[in-house]
């Protein structure tokens, strides 16, 4: 069964800066990755970035840099101040569309006890089957 993992880290140098890393553990071919915050995409969440393996990468404030780390994992740096700034209990979700498995989504947030610059290990979060 495919899995999606999500890791959220607050940067020690900039307390309003977060790094989200997501990966897909499956044998299929990834066709699209969508990163959102505030909940799953399409269920009240706000899209921060869309990454297509061949068509390109798109991102919107407060996302600063989205990129492919490998063929099956991505990272997104967020920064902001004011209303659009993430906070410690913000939920971030990553949705991977793949063939032939379909769409798989997982969400994560900053571990409550983590110090700036630290993060929980990238463990698979609860998986939502989207289709």
């Amino acid at each position: 069964t495919p899995e999606v993992w999500v890791q959220v880290r607050m940067e020690a140098t900039e307390l309003s800066s977060f790094t989200i890393r997501c990966g897909f553990l499956g044998s299929g071919s990834i066709s699209l990755v969508t990163v959102s915050w505030g909940g799953p995409n399409g269920a009240g969440g706000t899209t921060l970035a869309v990454l297509h393996p061949e068509r390109g990468i798109r991102q919107w404030a407060p996302a600063r840099q989205a990129r492919w780390e490998t063929q099956s994992s991505i990272s997104l740096i967020l920064e902001g101040s004011g209303a659009s700034s993430p906070c410690a209990n913000t939920t971030f979700c990553c949705k991977f569309a793949s063939f032939p498995e379909g769409s798989w989504e997982a969400c994560g947030s900053l571990p409550p006890s983590s110090d700036p610059g630290l993060s929980a290990p990238p463990t698979p979060a609860p998986i939502l089957r989207a289709d």
Partner: antibody
Framework: EVQLQQSGPEVVKPGASVKISCKAS????????INWVKQSHGKNLEWIGD????????NYNQKFKGKATLTVDKSSGTAFMGLRSLTSEDSAVYYC???????WGQGTTLTVSS | DIVMTQSPSSLSVSTGEKVTMSCRSS????????????LAWYQQKPGQPPKLLIY???TRESGVPDRFTGSGSGTDFTLTISSVQAEDLAIYYC?????????FGGGTRLEIK
């Protein structure tokens, strides 16, 4: 089938403002993220910017900052582009297109003339 | 901004001939993380909006005839039409799909003899 329906041609005077619309009807999330492209003299294509329907966040080509303002009405699936302080240099065909430019509107011709 | 340079600016061929056109970017369009090139090709016929032909430098968009082939990597890319048809009369544009602003080339106008 994704469709992008743009508003009709505009003829405006120099110094005026105009607002062009693009109504999207699509199947997936990415069909509602809209790019705007300017085509001058029937040839040169320039990316103006894009808009996120979730929160109205836009990315702009630096060249068009202060000239173009991108907005969206998520409930109706309509994106808008406002253009201000118009000059003859703004006369062009303006297109909207989906996130990865795989579907395009029919184009809106803007003529700025006194 | 990434500058996209296309050549030639125009060419004239007979139907059935093979044609190649070039696109060069001022910076690499290769995404190091997944080793994909973020370059697209468009066809624009008179009075119509551009139509996406190729993305990822070499992947044909759905419904595009297989006589259209994209190739290249990094900064140098080519669009090849293996056997030109009368309906291929158009201007062909390449686009940087890697980095905002998503710049277009100046186009190659294909004329049919």
């Amino acid at each position: 089938e994704v469709q992008l329906q743009q508003s009709g041609p505009e003829v405006v005077k120099p110094g005026a403002s105009v607002k062009i619309s693009c109504k999207a009807s699509g199947n997936t999330l990415t069909d509602y993220f809209i790019n705007w492209v300017k085509q001058s003299h029937g040839k040169n294509l320039e990316w103006i910017g894009d808009i996120n329907p979730d929160n109205g966040a836009g990315n702009y080509n630096q060249k068009f900052k202060g000239k173009a303002t991108l907005t969206v009405d998520k409930s109706s699936g309509t994106a808008f582009m406002g253009l201000r302080s118009l000059t003859s240099e703004d006369s062009a065909v303006y297109y909207c297109a989906t996130l990865y430019f795989d579907y395009w509107g029919q184009g809106t011709t803007l003529t700025v003339s006194s | 901004d990434i500058v996209m340079t296309q050549s030639p600016s125009s060419l004239s061929v007979s139907t059935g001939e093979k044609v190649t056109m070039s696109c060069r970017s001022s910076q690499s369009l290769l995404n190091s993380g997944n080793q994909k090139n973020y370059l697209a090709w468009y066809q624009q016929k008179p009075g119509q909006p551009p139509k996406l032909l190729i993305y990822g430098a070499s992947t044909r968009e759905s419904g595009v005839p297989d006589r259209f082939t994209g190739s290249g990597s990094g900064t140098d890319f080519t669009l090849t039409i293996s056997s030109v048809q009368a309906e291929d009369l158009a201007i062909y544009y390449c686009q940087n799909a890697h980095t905002s602003p998503y710049t277009f080339g100046g186009g190659t106008r294909l004329e049919i003899k």
